[in-house]
């Protein structure tokens, strides 16, 4: 039940994740114009990886998306680059956990394939999440080092004919809904990992002796039944009982790790 | 690169009007927000006016609101400016400048730049 709810929860906060890395990656506020001792303005400017947005007092906004590729700074390539990586691999990763699902029965998935699918699924959503905070932690800096940049500027500016002076830009909503929306796809990809443990088959050997009935060649177990742990391969239960019917290979029996005595 | 060229500039009277243009060489003139930034003689650079890449937003110096109105013609890859009820003070060196992120009154924004057309009023 543990290891249901874990899986559960952990696809859930990494599709709530995931969601928020797409959404940060399509936003335009990913750096905004800093109004700190800016000089009084009508417009306000604010960027994102796609394109850079003019906004009137009216509320007016005008958007013009980036149309050169070569033109654009490596480093913006670069976040563009780890946010799309960060959405493919939590896509994938969401498609394999819904297989994964203990909670959903598709055929006669056993649940050793479904504790690897849940592993595989964990790890692409930990990937995902640290592709989505190094974008948008490369961002971030690229801010900060331009704003201080910036601010040099303003008070060591050439002075006299030249002024250096330029707008500062600081940090937009879409960083920090990705920081939030790549901790939580990670926190998503580990509770996959941890639920993967509890869904792996135990290996526990069992020792089985086959009876003989003297009379006649029937190999007999007590309950009809083949036992099962709920792990291996015997999830359809075959009666072992067949009423003497057997092929050659049959007439010695093998303990099995899921027979009892 | 985009390659702008000023002109329209001249002597006018007090109170007169001067309309200037600038041309940009540039196919992707679109792309560009405009600018209009001024130096008078002894003076540092002074921001006049901006608009957005399809003239949707327009931004003013308040020295100069009421008085200049900022145009763009993207199929002529154009930026104007028309100067009304001129002032003495208004006499400088007009630039014409571009950027293509952001409409700023700070001129150090502005990346690309003309090289510039003298106004002059008289008296």
């Known amino acids: 039940m543990a290891v249901t709810a874990c899986q559960g929860l952990g696809f859930v906060v990494s599709l709530i994740g995931i969601a928020g890395i797409i959404a940060a990656t399509c936003m335009d506020q990913w750096s905004t114009q800093d109004l700190y001792n800016n000089p009084v303005t009508a417009v306000f400017n604010y960027q994102g990886l796609w394109r850079s947005c003019v906004r009137e007092s009216s509320g007016f906004t005008e958007c013009r998306g980036y149309f050169t590729l070569l033109g654009l700074p490596a480093m913006l390539q670069a976040v563009r680059a780890l946010m799309i990586v960060g959405i493919v691999l939590g896509a994938i990763g969401l498609l394999v956990s819904i297989f994964a699902l203990k909670c959903i029965r598709i055929g006669s998935m056993e649940d050793s394939a479904k504790a690897n699918m849940t592993l595989t699924s964990g790890i692409m959503f930990i990937v995902s999440g640290l592709c989505a905070i190094a974008g948008v932690s490369v961002f971030a800096n690229m801010l900060v080092t331009n704003f201080w940049m910036s601010t040099a500027n303003m008070y060591t500016g050439m002075g006299g004919m030249v002024q250096t002076v330029q707008t500062r830009y600081t940090f937009g909503a879409a960083l920090f809904v990705g920081w939030v929306a790549g901790g939580l796809t990670l926190i998503g990809g580990v509770m996959m990992c941890i639920a993967c443990r509890g869904l792996a088959p135990e290996e526990t050997n069992y020792k089985a002796v086959s009876y003989h009935a003297s009379g006649h060649s029937v190999a007999y177990k007590p309950g009809g039944f083949k036992a099962s742990t709920g792990f291996g391969s015997n999830t359809k239960n075959k009666k072992i009982y067949d009423g003497g019917a057997r092929t050659e290979d049959e007439v010695q029996s093998y303990p099995s790790k899921h027979d009892y005595v | 690169q985009v390659q702008l060229v000023e002109s329209g500039g001249g002597l006018v009277q007090t109170g007169g009007s001067l309309r200037l243009s600038c041309a940009a060489s540039?196919?992707?003139?679109?792309?560009?927000?405009m600018g209009w930034v001024r130096q008078a003689p002894g003076k540092g650079l002074e921001w006049v006016a901006g608009?957005?890449?399809?003239?949707?937003?327009?931004d003013y110096a308040d020295s100069v609101k009421g008085r200049f109105t900022i145009a763009r013609d993207n199929a002529k890859n154009t930026v104007y400016l028309q100067m009304n009820s001129l002032k003495p003070e208004d006499a400088a060196i007009y630039y014409c400048?571009?950027?293509?992120?952001?409409?700023?009154?700070?001129?150090?924004?502005?990346?690309?730049w003309g090289q510039g057309t003298q106004v002059t009023v008289s008296s």
């Open positions: 400048a571009a950027n293509a992120i952001q409409l700023t009154r700070r001129s150090g924004d502005y990346a690309y």
């Open positions: 608009i957005t890449w399809s003239g949707g937003i327009k």
């Open positions: 540039d196919s992707t003139f679109s792309s560009y927000i």
